[in-house]
């Protein structure tokens, strides 16, 4: 079937392909291509007030190609879609829209967030952290001897960084005060990180519980566990002047 059905024709070239431009099989001076050579897609191009038929090897942006027995034609994607496989499946949305399940949305559905790089609706990703690593040896100024009170630290890794709407990561570093059997440093022992050194259990008045530093949490979304720690900290400051303090890093 030729694509110009119902259109006024000035003159059809007598020879089907002679005088036709590019991939046209048949054409007219007024309407341009009327039908295309095999495998080429027929599209209408607006030039001023009139539409001209053109034959293309692939359809332009905003259109997709469909093959019928009588014509291969370019069909418009939905208005909010830039590139599509067909009317049901958009593969790239126009500016200001987010792609979700092949559709273009101006807002992402509940439980999803907009990724402004890919312009897609994606699952919200919450932070995931590993288990705490063991506490480091008790040290003071980098030494494991020649003191009674020192500090020990433990860390955990971020397994999964959160997305924009995801829960922030809890602290990944904790430091607490610790005590060791006072011992003079032997020659060559200065600064030795004595991993094998045994630590004494804390004295009754001392707590080995680590409390995140409230300052480092102020700028982050608090998770319930952190809020509880803040309250505990205030309470215990009154109870025990020798309270152990934690330095936290919030990601």
């Amino acid at each position: 079937q030729n694509a110009s059905r119902g259109r006024r024709q000035r003159r059809m070239h007598p020879n089907v392909s002679q005088g036709c431009q590019g991939g046209c099989a048949t054409c007219s001076d007024y309407n341009g291509c009327l039908s295309c050579k095999p495998r080429l897609f027929f599209a209408l191009e607006r030039i001023g007030m009139k539409q001209i038929g053109v034959c293309l090897s692939s359809c332009p942006s905003g259109y997709y190609g469909t093959r019928y027995p009588d014509i291969n034609k370019c069909t418009k994607c939905k208005a909010d879609c830039d590139t599509c496989f067909n009317k049901n499946f958009c593969t790239k949305c126009k500016s200001g829209f987010y792609l979700h399940l092949g559709k273009c949305l101006d807002n992402c559905p509940e439980g999803l967030e907009a990724n402004n790089h890919t312009m897609e609706c994606v699952s919200i990703v919450h932070c995931e952290v590993s288990e705490w690593n063991p506490w480091s040896p008790c040290t003071k100024k980098g030494k494991t001897c020649g003191f009674k009170r020192g500090t020990e630290t433990r860390v955990r890794e971020i397994i999964q960084h959160p997305s924009a709407k995801g829960n922030l990561c809890p602290p990944t570093n904790e430091t607490r005060k610790c005590t060791v059997q006072r011992k003079k440093c032997q020659k060559g022992e200065r600064g030795k990180k004595g991993r094998e050194r045994k630590r004494k259990k804390p004295n009754k008045g001392e707590s080995k519980e680590a409390i995140p530093d409230s300052k480092s949490l102020e700028s982050s979304k608090e998770i319930p566990e952190q809020r509880e720690n803040k309250q505990q900290q205030k309470k215990r400051k009154v109870q025990d002047k020798q309270k152990s303090v934690s330095v936290s890093t919030v990601h």
């Epitope: 079937q1 997709y64 469909t66 093959r67 019928y68 027995p69 009588d70 496989f85 067909n86 009317k87 049901n88 499946f89």
Partner: antibody, heavy 116, light 107 residues
Framework: EVQLVESGGGLVQPGRSLKLSCAAS????????MAWVRQAPKKGLEWVAT????????YYRDSVKGRFTISRANAKSTLYLQMDSLRSEDTATYYC?????????WGQGVMVTVSS | DIQMTQSPASLSASLGETVTIECRAS??????LAWYQQKPGNSPQLLIY???SLIHGVPSRFSGSGSGTQFSLKINNLQSEDVASYFC?????????FGAGTKLELK
Amino acid sequence: EVQLVESGGGLVQPGRSLKLSCAASGFTFSDYDMAWVRQAPKKGLEWVATIIYDGSRTYYRDSVKGRFTISRANAKSTLYLQMDSLRSEDTATYYCATHDKTFDYWGQGVMVTVSS
Amino acid sequence: DIQMTQSPASLSASLGETVTIECRASEDIYSDLAWYQQKPGNSPQLLIYDVNSLIHGVPSRFSGSGSGTQFSLKINNLQSEDVASYFCQQYDNYPNTFGAGTKLELK
């Protein structure tokens, strides 16, 4: 949610006629090319006919040309398949589907049995 | 008409296994190939279009490959819900034609 619901199937004698209907909802029916696809018992899928979105062009598989007529009523969001001169080899489950290169949405199917 | 030859006609595999279904076109269909899944008693459902583009919601253990006349569907880490018949379809030319199907069962 896209829904396609076929009706009109049944047992019919060879040479007789049957008309299938497919009621569409959940999408703009008048924007879509629609098709009928059939599946003989325990067999594969076979495209039968397609009608373009505005009803102006129709296409058929060779074995049903001249016997089957696909039509649509966009105002009613309904697709039809008029089947005349039925043969035993037309026995199958008939599905209506959106046809846009692929068959993206399918109805649940309706059984047509042609037997004396 | 373009003939689509699918193999095997049926196959039996164990949970967790990887299975591959082949589809051959009688002439070049470029990348105009789709795969459908039909679970027992249900209508077919589009899984993959343009050889390897997964429909949203289809698990990533499904993948498609090939071009021209040779195509395949691969299912990694087979799950019980994958028990179904699988059909390839070409849409490069009218009439659009399907493969005869591959029935996938669990061992």
